[in-house]
Interface confidence: medium
């Protein structure tokens, strides 16, 4: 807390420039009034205060608006908005995009910060709904958001965000979110080649069905086993023996190592031992020569 | 890598004027605040000022206001430092420095790149 | 201006010895920065915000303090380290700088 001090004769401050950074931080306090400071804020940006000085100027903005500032302020606090809390941003209320993007720039580069993300809360919020624009912008500045959203708020991101996902912005994606971002990745990437497709489309694979699947067995991809193993195994289980080795070529030495995980030891015991056994790897679990396979699932479908 | 390369200097007469050059390479030299510091022969290092990226902010240290022209040329990735009527008093090695900046752009409190220094000397 | 004074203003050491130097500010900083500077060299900085080591510095050196009191360590001198050492704060403007220790090896 900044003590109550006069401001000495001549150096109460008529504008925001330069000559406040030679001031003390008693003498910010007391030379620079709340209301002026709120409506240069633009200005802030652009002078090299020091970390403590911007302290003080935030001190001055939390007295002239207790229950939170307005839209007006908060557009243009730049490098400021680092000063501020979750509990701060908690009281404002952000509606426009423009002020949303200008914040989001501040920390541009960076993970999320507890600020970023409660200010995405407060303008989500505030807008009712999560519409395209705001989730452009925020997959711009944050790929690894769409995790954090509910399968229902997904549905209306646009495939062109997906251009921005990094492969590391998925891995806290639950399979239910990757079902839905799928089939918009498959849209987005539709036009690229064969083997360039595969490299947009993997981290997202996690939501493919299994024709899809299929498919790419006949396209000499050569799926590493991490890739594999986020497979959905509902997907997998139909896949026959050829068609799993076709998809991980070289990589399906790898299933050895797996064969006790999901969705590998589930696959397994939907294959034939003969079968399995064309791979020369000793995977064992298969279904014995000589058993009938019915697929029950198939039998429910046509009663 | 990483580079201030200065220019300019030398011996000067009392009243004349001086112009130092300080050319980055390395880095994205339009994105930084730059300064000037100069060290008198067995003195401390002595702050100048600074400018910011796109000229549009110069800060001089109180007592040099007056003395010192700071600029900068980000097409020619360049920082200048000019004065005139130059005394005794004068002489001293310039560095040219930058301002450290975090990863969200805002700058640091540190220098973190320096020049090999100018060496200036007033003299008749 | 925040005036700050180093101590000592020379000092010696023997290689593998443990060297502490001090900082003191005539009015309260945040952080402090500490540069090296040997003959015919420009500065480089040593350690940012008070206790940080800056890129390809060595292990050996560390910084600690508060307030008005700082003070910068090297764990075991080397040769190497002989050299002019000096304290910075940019706390408040005019950002200003120690007069510098100058360490010498025994």
């Known amino acids: 807390e900044v003590e109550k001090t006069a401001c000495p004769s001549g150096k109460k401050a008529r504008e925001i420039d330069e000559s406040l950074i030679f001031y003390k931080k008693w003498e910010l306090e007391a030379c620079v009034d709340a209301a002026l400071l709120a409506t240069q804020m633009d200005r802030v940006n652009a002078i090299p205060f020091t970390y403590e000085q911007l302290d003080v100027l935030k001190h001055k903005l939390d007295e002239l608006y207790p229950q939170g500032y307005p839209e007006s302020v908060i557009q243009h606090l730049g490098y400021l908005f680092l000063k501020m809390s979750p509990e701060d941003i908690r009281k404002w209320n952000v509606t426009s995009l423009e002020t949303l993007k200008a914040l989001l720039e501040v920390n541009k580069g960076h993970e999320m910060s507890p600020q970023v993300a409660t200010l995405i809360d407060r303008f989500v919020k505030g807008r009712g709904q999560l519409d395209k624009d705001t989730l452009d912008t925020l997959t711009a500045f944050y790929p690894g958001y769409l995790c954090s959203l509910s399968p229902e708020e997904l549905s209306s991101v646009p495939p062109s965000s997906i251009w921005a996902v990094r492969p590391q912005d998925l891995d806290t994606c639950d399979p239910r979110q990757l079902d839905v971002l799928y089939p918009k990745a498959r849209l987005a990437f539709q036009n690229m080649n064969g083997s360039e497709y595969f490299v947009k489309i993997q981290s997202f694979l996690g939501g493919a069905p299994t024709e899809d699947l299929k498919a790419l067995s006949q396209q000499n991809v050569s799926m590493d086993l991490a890739t594999f193993m986020k497979l959905r195994t509902d997907a997998v289980l139909p896949l026959t023996v050829a068609e799993v080795q076709k998809l991980l070529g070289p990589h399906v030495e790898g299933l050895k190592a797996e064969e006790r995980h999901r969705p590998v030891r589930d696959w397994i015991l939907r294959q034939r031992q003969d079968d399995l056994d064309t791979l020369g790897l000793g995977l064992q679990g298969g279904i014995p020569n000589g058993y009938l396979v019915l697929d029950l699932s198939m039998q429910e479908a046509l009663s | 890598q990483v580079k201030l390369k200065q220019s300019g200097g030398g011996l000067v007469q009392p009243g004349g004027s001086l112009k130092v050059s300080c050319a980055a390479s390395g880095f994205d030299f339009s994105r930084y605040w730059m300064s000037w510091v100069r060290q008198a022969p067995g003195k401390g290092l002595e702050w100048i000022g600074e400018?910011?990226?796109?000229?549009?902010?110069?800060v001089y240290t109180p007592s040099l206001k007056d003395k010192f022209i700071m600029s900068r040329d980000n097409a020619k990735n360049t920082l200048y430092l000019q004065t005139s009527k130059v005394r005794s008093a004068d002489t001293a090695l310039y560095y040219c420095?930058?301002?450290?900046?975090?990863?969200?752009?805002?700058?640091?409190?540190?220098?973190?790149?320096w020049g090999a220094g100018t060496t200036v000397t007033v003299s008749s | 201006d925040v005036v700050l004074t180093q101590s000592p203003a020379i000092m010696s050491a023997s290689p593998g010895e443990k060297v502490t130097m001090t900082c003191s500010a005539s009015?309260?900083?945040?952080?402090m920065y500490w540069g090296q500077q040997k003959p015919g060299s420009s500065p480089r900085l040593l350690i940012y915000d008070t206790s940080n080591l800056a890129s390809g510095v060595p292990v050996r050196f560390s910084g600690s303090g508060s307030g008005t009191s700082y003070s910068l360590t090297i764990s075991r001198m080397e040769a190497e380290d002989a050299a002019t050492y000096y304290c910075?704060?940019?706390?408040?403007?005019?950002?200003?700088f120690g007069g510098g220790t100058k360490l010498e090896i025994k």
């Open positions: 009015s309260s900083v945040s952080y």
């Open positions: 420095a930058r301002r450290g900046s975090h990863y969200y752009g805002y700058r640091t409190g540190y220098f973190d790149v």
């Open positions: 910075q704060q940019w706390s408040s403007y005019p950002p200003t």
């Open positions: 400018i910011n990226p796109d000229s549009s902010t110069i």
